[in-house]
């Protein structure tokens, strides 16, 4: 058993049929010695008396909020949560496996630049009685500070018969140098509690590997006189690290016909313009990627060829 | 039929071309190592991230763009006098060129060159003959060092009398290649910045 936060405790249980469970001793936080009784949750049934209560925790029915009273007055609470371990593996029932970039990916994180700011998100089908708490650090043995905000519900989607909920959190490394060469990864730890079930999820990464620039901005077409050609131009996104001559981007330019069957025409370039022949009903798209370290491409910025 | 590869026009910062070749070569070599050594811990997640230049050179700090010098987190051990030798500088004088920047890059390259050559000598003794260092990568390191044109004592190749442990050597190769790729990215950023200055 260990303390998650004040008056909230996690009991780690090997989860198999007829498992012996875990013996837990609760102590009432009071100077009083006599006349103390214990109850569980809303029940008025007295479970025991005295300053301590010993219980055998085997299943969710044994978890919950234990309260010690004296003469009708509440003295203190202890909330017991269960963390299940099945076949030596901690349960992952609360969050959905996103399977990207590999199986057992429950947390996904992205950064728009090298400032040390990043966003992580996760998915669940659970809609109520759910809380998350996020901690992060750079390295684990001698951790350096990363500050995370509160996790918030950021999107709801319907997937077949199920509703899916996306939660996200923003974190900022306390003292980040955009030009630094990372040797210790960022560690992100999410505590998830659904009713009386506790689970924890972790992710470890270098900022350089989770970079995904915003799409190029101000994508514009300028017709060239006396020809079918147009000059396509774009700019670095505002959120990208500066100076741009140091943190350079490379771009992928694509011309796509209206029909998805038509072959896409694409090139890569370090420039912020290209000459394009505009076909009727075609669209021109541009996306960005760090020029020197191949992390994710941005989403496409697109403009119709009208 | 291949023409001789075009060199950048004389007005262009001469080392940019070489640094781009360096990043390409080390990235290709790392990819080859990951594939060839698929049953060894050779991915970014599996290896320990070591920097053989740590406490010996200060490339990141010395080559910091002017715009980042206001960032307290970037100013660990900053030197501020200016570089004056080295052919990559051509005739440009810019406050970005602090002492240590290009000479620090040169020292990085020299250290990695020695490590890679020593390692290659060991790998050539491996009866499995599983992996060797790409000669192109070694040549590109040499070209960039020549373009930087710093006079520096030659470091003798390390020789070892004991029987090499080929498993450890291959893991060390992965660690070195990962670290060198990260440094090659920094070098490319620096050269790009200098070229734009």
């Amino acid at each position: 058993i260990w303390e998650l936060k004040k008056d909230v405790y996690v009991v780690e249980l090997d989860w198999y049929p007829d498992a012996p469970g875990e013996m837990v001793v609760l102590t009432c936080d009071t100077p009083e010695e006599d006349g103390i009784t214990w109850t569980l949750d809303q029940s008025s049934e007295v479970l025991g008396s005295g300053k301590t209560l010993t219980i055998q925790v085997k299943e969710f029915g044994d978890a919950g909020q234990y309260t010690c009273h004296k003469g009708g007055e509440v003295l203190s609470h202890s909330l017991l949560l269960l963390h299940k371990k099945e076949d030596g593996i901690w349960s992952t029932d609360i969050l959905k496996d996103q399977k990207e970039p590999k199986n057992k990916t429950f947390l996904r994180c992205e950064a728009k630049n090298y400032s040390g700011r990043f966003t992580c998100w996760w998915l669940t089908t659970i809609s109520t009685d759910l809380t998350f708490s996020v901690k992060s650090s750079r390295g684990s043995s001698d951790p350096q500070g990363v500050t995370c905000g509160a996790a918030t519900l950021s999107a709801e989607r319907v997937r077949g018969d199920n509703k899916e909920y996306e939660y996200s959190v923003e974190c900022q490394e306390d003292s980040a140098c955009p030009a630094a060469e990372e040797s210790l990864p960022i560690e992100v730890m999410v505590d998830a509690v659904h009713k009386l079930k506790y689970e924890n999820y972790t992710s470890s990464f270098f900022i350089r590997d989770i970079i995904k620039p915003d799409p190029p901005k101000n994508l514009q077409l300028k017709p060239l006189k006396n020809s079918r050609q147009v000059e396509v131009s774009w700019e670095y996104p505002d959120t990208w690290s500066t100076p741009h001559s140091y943190f350079s981007l490379t771009f992928c330019v694509q011309v796509q016909g209206k029909s998805k069957r038509e072959k896409k025409d694409r090139v890569f370039t370090d420039k912020t313009s290209a000459t394009v022949i505009c076909r009727k009903n075609a669209s021109i798209s541009v996306r960005a990627q760090d020029r020197y370290y191949s992390s994710s491409w941005s989403e496409w910025a697109s403009v119709p060829c009208s | 039929r291949n023409l001789p590869v075009a060199t950048p026009d004389p007005g262009m910062f001469p080392c940019l071309h070489h640094s781009q070749n360096l990043l390409r070569a080390v990235s290709n070599m790392l990819q080859k190592a990951r594939q060839t050594l698929e049953f060894y811990p050779c991915t970014s997640e599996e290896i320990d991230h070591e920097d053989i230049t740590k406490d010996k050179t200060s490339t990141v700090e010395a080559c910091l763009p002017l715009e980042l010098t206001k960032n307290e987190s970037c100013l660990n051990s900053r030197e501020t006098s200016f570089i004056t030798n080295g052919s990559c500088l051509a005739s440009r004088k810019t406050s970005f060129m602090m002492a240590l920047c290009l000479s620090s890059i040169y020292e990085d390259l020299k250290m990695y060159q020695v490590e890679f050559k020593t390692m290659n000598a060991k790998l050539l003794m491996d009866p499995k003959r599983q992996i060797f260092l790409d000669q192109n990568m070694l040549a590109v390191i040499d070209e960039l060092m020549q373009a930087l044109n710093f006079n520096s004592e030659t470091v003798p190749q390390k020789s070892s009398l004991e029987e090499p442990d080929f498993y450890k050597t291959k893991i060390k190769l992965c660690i070195l290649l990962h670290a060198f790729r990260i440094r090659a990215v920094t070098i490319d950023r620096v050269m790009s910045y200098l070229n734009a200055s």
């Epitope: 011309v255 025409d265 890569f268 370039t269 420039k271 290209a274 000459t275 022949i277 | 023409l3 290709n28």
Partner: nanobody
């Protein structure tokens, strides 16, 4: 292996026009970016224009923008460089080169590092 042959060069007066052709044999050019380079005596070789595999995206150096047009006919396995308003400074040997689009290196359209090269055709612009 792609073999490239340039044609269409010659002597022309300033202000005149020429159309260079680059024909490929040995393999289809459909999956290749194709570029036209030039090298004047005593000068560096430079990329003049390049065209994407589908022909819809192009790159030109500033000095030829609005005067030169690169195009391709994939059915004929040929790439063209239409040169109008020629100037004496356009005098050079013009080379055609091809770069495989889906190579691991993911080469840029403005790159000067091409896989296959032709022998070149001389263009001379007299004043």
């Amino acid at each position: 292996e792609v073999q490239l042959v340039e044609s269409g060069g010659g002597l022309v007066q300033a202000g005149g026009s020429l159309r260079l052709s680059c024909s490929a044999s040995g393999r289809s050019l459909n999956d290749y970016i194709v570029g036209w380079f030039r090298q004047a005596p005593g000068k560096e070789r430079e990329l003049v224009a390049a065209i994407s595999s589908g022909g819809y995206i192009q790159h030109y150096i500033d000095s030829v923008k609005g005067r030169f047009t690169i195009s391709r006919d994939n059915a004929k396995n040929t790439v063209y460089l239409q040169m109008n308003g020629l100037k004496p400074e356009d005098t050079a040997v013009y080379y055609c080169a091809a770069n495989q689009l889906n190579g691991v290196a993911r080469k840029k359209i403005e790159s000067d590092d091409y896989d296959y090269w032709g022998q070149g055709t001389q263009v001379t612009v007299s004043s």
